[in-house]
Amino acid sequence: MLSHTGPSRFALFLLCSMETLLSSHMAPTHQLPPSDVRKIILELQPLSRGLLEDYQKKETGVPESNRTLLLCLTSDSQPPRLNSSAILPYFRAIRPLSDKNIIDKIIEQLDKLKFQHEPETEISVPADTFECKSFILTILQQFSACLESVFKSLNSGPQ
């Protein structure tokens, strides 16, 4: 079934940061300014929205799971930031069962926000077909809501 990781483990993730450069000019990925984070969120929003809408059309009548909680925001920063390391394992897990092309684009964007060398939790998808569909829907819904929340915080004045 699902393997969850508590907030304390995620807090530990946030302490792990390396000075690896993506390129000679680029700041380390965990050191992007709010302006660049906002650019990445703007790229993620239509991908996430499109993926969710397509899935809802394809899988009508599937309810949201109450057993899945995407810990998508960091608790240690103001405004809240997207907790890429917590989200990535879910998208890697649902990739074979959803639109691989769009999921790959989402993963590519999330990788840019990820702290360097953070361990990722293992996420296992429910074996039951109906539960699996419910799990995927929940991830997509929570991720869209999460992006909306972060985008609003980045737009609400001084960082």
């Epitope: 940061s17 993506l22 390129s23 000019h25 680029m26 700041a27 380390p28 990925t29 965990h30 050191q31 992007l32 300014p33 709010p34 302006s35 660049d36 906002r38 650019k39 990445i40 703007l42 790229e43 239509p46 840019k112 980045l154 001084p158 960082q159």
Partner: antibody
Framework: EVQLQESGPSLVKPSQTLSLTCSVT????????WNWIRKFPGNKLEYMGY???????DYNPSLKSRISITRDTSKNQYYLQLNSVTTEDTATYYC????????????WGQGTSVTVSS | DIVLTQSPASLAVSPGQRATISCRAS??????????IHWYQQKPGQSPKLLIY???NLESGIPARFSGSGSRTDFTLTINPVETDDVATYYC?????????FGGGTKLEIK
């Protein structure tokens, strides 16, 4: 080498639409972020907005109701449209590339001077 | 919006001397030890040219006479020694927060 070249009319009448083209060589507009900046006669620089590698746009809130940035990937060009111009929009308009997160605008066009006058 | 205040508005320096230009931000432009302030040089009739990125990193092809320093809200561009070819207006720019903003510019003249 990356080169950007602005083109468009040098004179626009008040209330009309200012339309400019930025032609890019040496890089593809399907990577990076492609910006418009203007410099007013008093030397003040203003950031106007961008179109991204995927076609996403974002604008300076001070211009949001009047500005549109579009692109044609087949021509490797991107465009600026500024509606309802006034004499306050008289400026030199530059296009520039923002290639990497956490970096700066490293390549600029030479600029094109636009006067708004009747 | 973050306001960048440059000083002085203009300065005249003799060749071989040091020129110092200040840029003050209305709020911090730092994230995890990186300062998102960049410096450009604009010569008459030309487009802006990137000199320094992230406060202190020299852009490729720019002479080491140019250097940048500072953090949080206070930044400095130093040209040492100044050459006659350095006559230009110098601008700071922040990419920390949207919308990106520029300083008012500092015009450098040679005595």
């Amino acid at each position: 080498e990356v080169q950007l070249q602005e083109s468009g009319p040098s004179l626009v009448k008040p209330s009309q639409t200012l339309s400019l083209t930025c032609s890019v060589t040496g890089d593809s507009i399907t990577s990076g972020y492609w910006n418009w900046i203007r410099k007013f006669p008093g030397n003040k620089l203003e950031y106007m907005g961008y179109i991204s590698y995927s076609g996403i746009t974002d604008y300076n809130p001070s211009l949001k109701s009047r500005i549109s940035i579009t692109r044609d990937t087949s021509k490797n060009q991107y465009y600026l449209q500024l509606n309802s111009v006034t004499t306050e929009d008289t400026a030199t308009y530059y296009c520039a590339r923002y290639g990497n997160y956490g970096y700066a605008m490293d390549y600029w066009g030479q600029g094109t001077s636009v006067t708004v006058s009747s | 919006d973050i306001v960048l205040t440059q000083s002085p508005a203009s300065l005249a320096v003799s060749p071989g001397q040091r020129a110092t230009i200040s840029c003050r931000a209305s709020e911090s432009v730092d994230t995890y030890g990186n300062s998102f302030i960049h410096w450009y040089q604009q010569k008459p009739g030309q487009s802006p040219k990137l000199l320094i990125y992230r406060a202190s990193n020299l852009e490729s092809g720019i002479p080491a006479r140019f250097s940048g320093s500072g953090s949080r809200t206070d930044f400095t561009l130093t040209i040492n020694p100044v050459e006659t070819d350095d006559v230009a207006t110098y601008y700071c720019q922040q990419s920390y927060e949207d919308p990106w903003t520029f300083g008012g510019g500092t015009k450098l003249e040679i005595k």
